[in-house]
């Protein structure tokens, strides 16, 4: 019995005086508490309280449930206690089929003893299975056997208590242990599409999906910049043990404009927490809008190629294109094409490939698309470079020389004079009249030039040279003038091409 | 053993909120399931939700999503669950129970409590 | 939500009769079925769990089978204590039950 200095309360004195006390089943139990200021008896055994306020406890015939912890408390607060153990060979474990462990912590298998003075007092698998390798426990008597360190792995195993009584192993009832698992990592969450596009009065439906350990994981949809509730729907699996998943779907059945925004879906457990965004745009009605992915204006030289290609984003999808030139549809040379799979793709590619283009095929080029609620268009003009041709050259009876030459971009005519059987001809001669001939025409085929020099200025035998070029190349042609007294001859002329 | 002792029997007007509550005598009630499950007369049963009060989230049914509220109260070993808007057709018998999340079966009931609706 | 579909929705038996009730998932629910005993005015009482375990306590003559969708409960020969409603129920989706069988004295 404990020893207190004089003068301070002291704890009550129990008889019998022991920690511990083994009766037999059907024996009677007699506890007295010494105490001047006695208030109660408290009897405690798995979860389990009585209560007595009589100083002297007394069960006259005692039986396995009767083994427990006997405390006499004071008015002091002050208690003292004895263990009584009710040996009772056809009840060895006091049992609470309960059994609950949280993850890397310790849990008790409750199934203390009657008899402290059994063996082998341990815990074994059900049905002669072995316990996992790495199920670590501790045995105490009074309280049970202590699992230390419960592992998921243990969810759902099968357990009894075990001792060994006149060399024959006694079992307990069957224990299931349920395993709550610790949050080691914040929840997965991911959203079913990234972005939306709608038009006012279509419904906005989006789902999260939340994957954790457990179903008690925290998740809600949030509007970004605002506390209002959204309105959510759920639906949940376990796709067994530790393994669960939550679809969150967020509906708003006719969007309007201003429900554009970001909305996130947020979840969290006791390790920490994630999201995830999604953004809607409204719009009040659908739209296309081009992009050259070229200028619109194109030069292009004679036989070569070239594509006009264009971006466009259409909402919702296009459902017409058509490239159009000189009043004609193309049917093909064109292919169009999503700018990506993505489900949510607004963004779309056109292109049409012009080949070995001719001199009299620039024009105006125009891409058309429709949707269910606009039309689009975007115009290339293409000018098609071409040498210059020379057209006529001739001497005229006013006794001028003209050259008329067509060509892309406009050619420009030079004239020389070479004297004798020169070959090459240097001296230039300035012209007396130069003329576009076509500019108030269409501006994408070839343009015309005249050009015209007095012959009347050459004294000499000797040849004019009509050199036409421009950016793509050159085109020359020749005069010969011959002398026979005091008469001009033309003689032949003649082009030559000079790359 | 342990055991789930349940509030007693209440009668409310339509439009108002029962709040009933279950205490659970001794075990790890931290780490239970503790879930709610209804029986109107003469019906079956029904599940509204549950709480595991460790964790602190409560998982609703949809049907009740909105209207039912499940909390825990550790330090007394006590579940509650609050049901608002009370209709006629919410005149059931309210059961708590052990388990019914993350798989788990009930396998303790409370004795239940009549909720009778009625103006 | 997963529907629970008990058959028969009431049957009457004699004391010693074997007694089966079956309970359809519309949906596959692995292992996670429960059957449940529930007596007039009582709560329910757990019988078997996970589809085929006994509950302690549960007499032997209780038996569950099946997985996926199709479940059965057995009840090899029927005693006078016997004769109650019996619920299954699925814990993989927000729980349901089944509509329950009612045993009746023939």
């Known amino acids: 019995q404990p020893s207190v200095s004089p003068g301070e309360p002291s704890p009550p004195s129990i008889h019998p005086g022991k920690s511990d006390l083994i009766v037999r089943v059907g024996d009677e139990i007699r506890l007295l508490c010494t105490d001047p200021g006695f208030v109660k008896w408290t009897f405690e055994i798995l979860d389990e309280t009585n209560e007595n306020k009589q100083n002297e406890w007394i069960t006259e015939k005692a039986e396995a449930t009767n083994t427990g912890k006997y405390t006499c408390t004071n008015k002091h607060g002050l208690s003292n206690s004895i263990y009584v153990f009710v040996r009772d060979p056809a009840k060895l474990f006091l049992v609470d089929r309960s059994l609950y462990g949280k993850e890397d912590n310790d849990t008790l298998v409750r199934c203390p003893l009657t008899d402290p003075e059994v063996t082998n007092y341990s815990l074994k698998g059900c049905q002669g299975k072995p316990l996992p390798k790495d199920l670590r426990f501790i045995p105490d008597p009074k309280a049970g056997i202590m699992i230390k360190s419960v592992k998921r792995a243990y969810h759902r195993l099968c357990l009894h208590c075990s001792v060994d009584q006149e060399g024959k192993s006694v079992l307990s009832e069957k224990f299931i242990l349920k395993v709550r698992p610790a949050f080691k990592a914040v929840p997965v969450v991911s959203v079913s599409k990234a972005s939306y596009l709608l038009r006012e009065g279509e419904e906005f439906t989006v789902t999260c999906t939340i994957k954790d350990v457990s179903s008690s994981v925290y998740s809600t949809w949030k509007r970004e910049n605002s506390q209002t509730k959204l309105q959510e729907k759920y639906n949940s699996w376990h796709h067994g043990d530790f393994n669960y998943e939550r679809q969150a779907t967020l509906t708003i059945s006719s969007a309007r404009v201003n429900d554009s925004g970001v909305f996130m879906c947020y979840a969290n457990n006791t390790f920490g927490s994630a999201n995830v965004t999604t953004t809607l745009e409204v719009v009040d009605k659908g739209f296309i809008n081009i992009f050259p992915m070229i200028n619109t204006t194109v030069f292009v030289n004679d036989g070569e190629n070239v594509d006009l290609i264009v971006e466009y984003e259409a909402f919702p999808k296009p459902e017409h294109q058509q490239w159009i030139y000189m009043n004609r549809t193309f049917t093909d040379k064109w292919e169009d094409y999503p700018k990506s799979e993505n489900e949510s793709n607004i963004r779309y590619v056109s292109e049409l490939h012009l080949t070995r283009l001719k001199g009299t095929e620039g024009g105006t080029y125009t891409f058309l698309v429709s949707n269910s609620d606009v039309n689009a268009a975007i115009a290339f003009n293409v000018y098609v470079n071409t040498k210059p041709e020379i057209l006529t050259y001739d001497r005229l009876v006013n006794g001028m020389l003209q050259c008329v030459a067509a060509g892309f971009p406009e050619p420009t005519i030079d004239w020389y004079f070479c004297p004798g059987t020169e070959q090459r001809c240097s001296a230039s001669v300035l012209p007396v009249d130069v003329q576009t001939l076509n500019s108030s025409g269409p501006p994408f085929g070839k343009l015309v030039v005249q050009s015209s020099i007095d012959s009347s200025a050459f004294k000499h035998n000797g040849t004019v040279e009509c050199k036409a070029y421009n950016d793509v190349g050159k085109t020359s042609a020749y005069f010969n003038f011959a002398f026979k007294g005091n008469n001009k001859e033309q003689i032949h002329p003649h082009t030559l091409f000079t790359p | 053993q342990v055991q789930l002792v349940q509030s007693g029997a209440e009668v409310k007007k339509p439009g108002s909120s029962v709040k009933v509550s279950c205490k659970a005598s001794?075990?790890?009630?931290?780490?239970?399931?503790i879930s709610w499950v209804r029986q109107a007369p003469g019906q079956g049963l029904e599940w509204m939700g549950g709480?595991?009060?460790?964790?602190?989230?409560?998982n609703y049914a949809q049907k009740f999503q909105g209207r039912v509220t499940i909390t825990a109260d550790e330090s007394t070993s006590t579940a509650y669950m609050e049901l608002s808007s009370l209709r006629s057709e919410d005149t059931a018998v309210y059961y708590c129970?052990?388990?019914?999340?993350?798989?788990?079966?009930?396998?303790?009931w409370g004795r239940g409590t009549l909720v009778t609706v009625s103006s | 939500d997963i529907q629970m579909t008990q058959s028969p929705s009431s049957l009457s038996a004699s004391v010693g009769d074997r007694v089966t009730i079956t309970c359809r998932a519309s949906?596959?629910?692995?292992?996670?079925l429960n059957w449940y005993q529930q007596k007039p005015g009582k709560a329910p009482k757990l019988l078997i769990y996970?589809?085929?375990s006994l509950q302690s306590g549960v007499p032997s003559r209780f038996s569950g089978s099946g997985s996926g969708t199709d479940f059965t409960l057995t009840i090899s020969s029927l005693q006078p204590e016997d004769f109650a409603t019996y619920y299954c129920?699925?814990?993989?989706?927000?729980?349901?039950f089944g509509g329950g069988t009612k045993v009746e004295i023939k």
């Open positions: 001794g075990g790890t009630f931290r780490i239970y399931a």
């Open positions: 709480i595991i009060p460790d964790f602190g989230v409560a």
């Open positions: 996970a589809a085929s």
């Open positions: 949906q596959s629910i692995n292992s996670y």
């Open positions: 129970a052990r388990g019914g999340l993350d798989t788990d079966e009930f396998d303790l």
């Open positions: 129920q699925q814990g993989v989706s927000d729980i349901t």
